[in-house]
């Protein structure tokens, strides 16, 4: 039975040209995290494998940095980066947990962070 929950940074906004940290946290389970995949609309951004470390997709090498922790830092943001991002936690023995973050990249200098929310 999957008892864990994923807490994410929720709906967030950032300025064009700036950076943003995507963060997820798995709680309420003792399952072992074997791998975390980061996706943007079905496209792989990065993998953090517990044994083998990080892989940043070649398509994003120049704009994506690993961390902090199991999170991901997006740099040199453009309006095209607006959209859904997913953290996919592969765990043993529970299985797969998925968290969703919506990022809006704003042209203006006013960019406020949204509230946190949980996905069971």
């Amino acid at each position: 039975m999957m008892t864990g929950t994923i807490e994410t940074t929720g709906n967030i906004s950032a300025e064009k040209g700036g950076s943003i940290i995507l963060q997820c946290h798995l709680s309420s389970t003792t399952a072992q995290v074997t791998q975390v995949n980061w996706e943007q609309q079905d496209q792989l951004l990065a993998i953090c494998n517990a044994d083998l470390g990080w892989h940043i997709s070649p398509s994003f090498k120049d704009r994506v940095a690993p961390g902090p922790g199991l999170g991901l830092t997006l740099q040199s943001l453009t309006v095209n980066d607006t959209g859904e991002y997913f953290c996919i936690y592969h765990t043993y023995p529970d299985g797969t947990y998925t968290g969703r973050i919506f990022l809006e990249v704003l042209e203006s200098s006013v960019a406020e962070h949204g509230a946190r929310f949980q996905i069971p």
Partner: antibody, heavy 122, light 113 residues
Framework: EVQLVQSGAEVKKPGSSVKVSCKAS????????IGWVRQAPGQGLEWIGD????????NYNEKFKDRVTITADKSTSTAYMEFSSLRSEDTAVYYC???????????????WGQGTLVTVSS | DIVMTQSPDSLAVSLGERATINCKSS????????????LAWYQQKPGQSPKLLIY???TRESGVPDRFSGSGSGTDFTLTISSLQAEDVAVYYC?????????FGGGTKVEIK
């Protein structure tokens, strides 16, 4: 011992399709990329595409994108490459490879299958 | 696409002598975050599958003799066989794995003079 064992040689008619398999053993299948590379007779190496089974993420060479589908079956640790609308110039040896593209090890295509000769002829 | 240009196309070297193969990429293969160049070298003997020799420009794969060495950074790379042996007769390919699509050089055929 890491091994990649490919299916046998194929002879195909122009316009048809071929599906080549690659069975992996000796490592955790879902942790590494499986790539496909071809080599026409007497020619060099050409990357077709790859798949990461731990998420089924695929990447294709634009040159082949409309004609190639790469899949993986984690239950049998087997990857497949299906090539459609075959032409005589697709006659080649097709290799599967294991790819290590982690930023801390980065060993590229560290293991290769024995190759599968696909002959396209009318 | 990154274009990989190898030279020479073929090379005849006496046993025990040095063989040098060059590889040039059309853009830098250096990844700033780990300061590694995503460049590999493969050896393909007649009738065999290619075999990984060197990755990250200069790291020898396990079991590869130390007469094989790689060097370079950015866009210019070299594979050196310090003392050619009969079993080194093969075609050698460089390959970039920095960006998609991964691309290979055209190959260099090494023969005994």
């Amino acid at each position: 011992e890491v091994q990649l064992v490919q299916s046998g040689a194929e002879v195909k008619k122009p316009g048809s399709s071929v599906k080549v398999s690659c069975k992996a053993s000796g490592y955790t299948f879902s942790n590494y990329w499986i790539g496909w590379v071809r080599q026409a007779p007497g020619q060099g190496l050409e990357w077709i595409g790859d798949i990461y089974p731990g998420g089924a993420y695929t990447n294709y060479n634009e040159k082949f994108k409309d004609r190639v589908t790469i899949t993986a079956d984690k239950s049998t640790s087997t990857a497949y490459m299906e090539f459609s609308s075959l032409r005589s110039e697709d006659t080649a040896v097709y290799y599967c490879t294991r790819g290590d593209y982690y930023d801390s090890s980065g060993r590229a295509m560290d293991y290769w299958g024995q190759g599968t000769l696909v002959t396209v002829s009318s | 696409d990154i274009v990989m240009t190898q030279s020479p196309d073929s090379l005849a070297v006496s046993l025990g002598e040095r063989a040098t193969i060059n590889c040039k990429s059309s853009q830098s293969l250096l990844y700033s975050r780990n300061q590694m160049n995503y460049l590999a070298w493969y050896q393909q003997k007649p009738g065999q599958s290619p075999k990984l020799l060197i990755y990250w420009t200069s790291t020898r794969e396990s079991g590869v003799p130390d007469r094989f060495s790689g060097s370079g950074s950015g866009t210019d790379f070299t594979l050196t066989i310090s003392s050619l042996q009969a079993e080194d007769v093969a075609v050698y390919y460089c390959q970039q794995y920095y960006s998609y699509p991964y691309t290979f050089g055209g190959g260099t055929k090494v023969e005994i003079k």
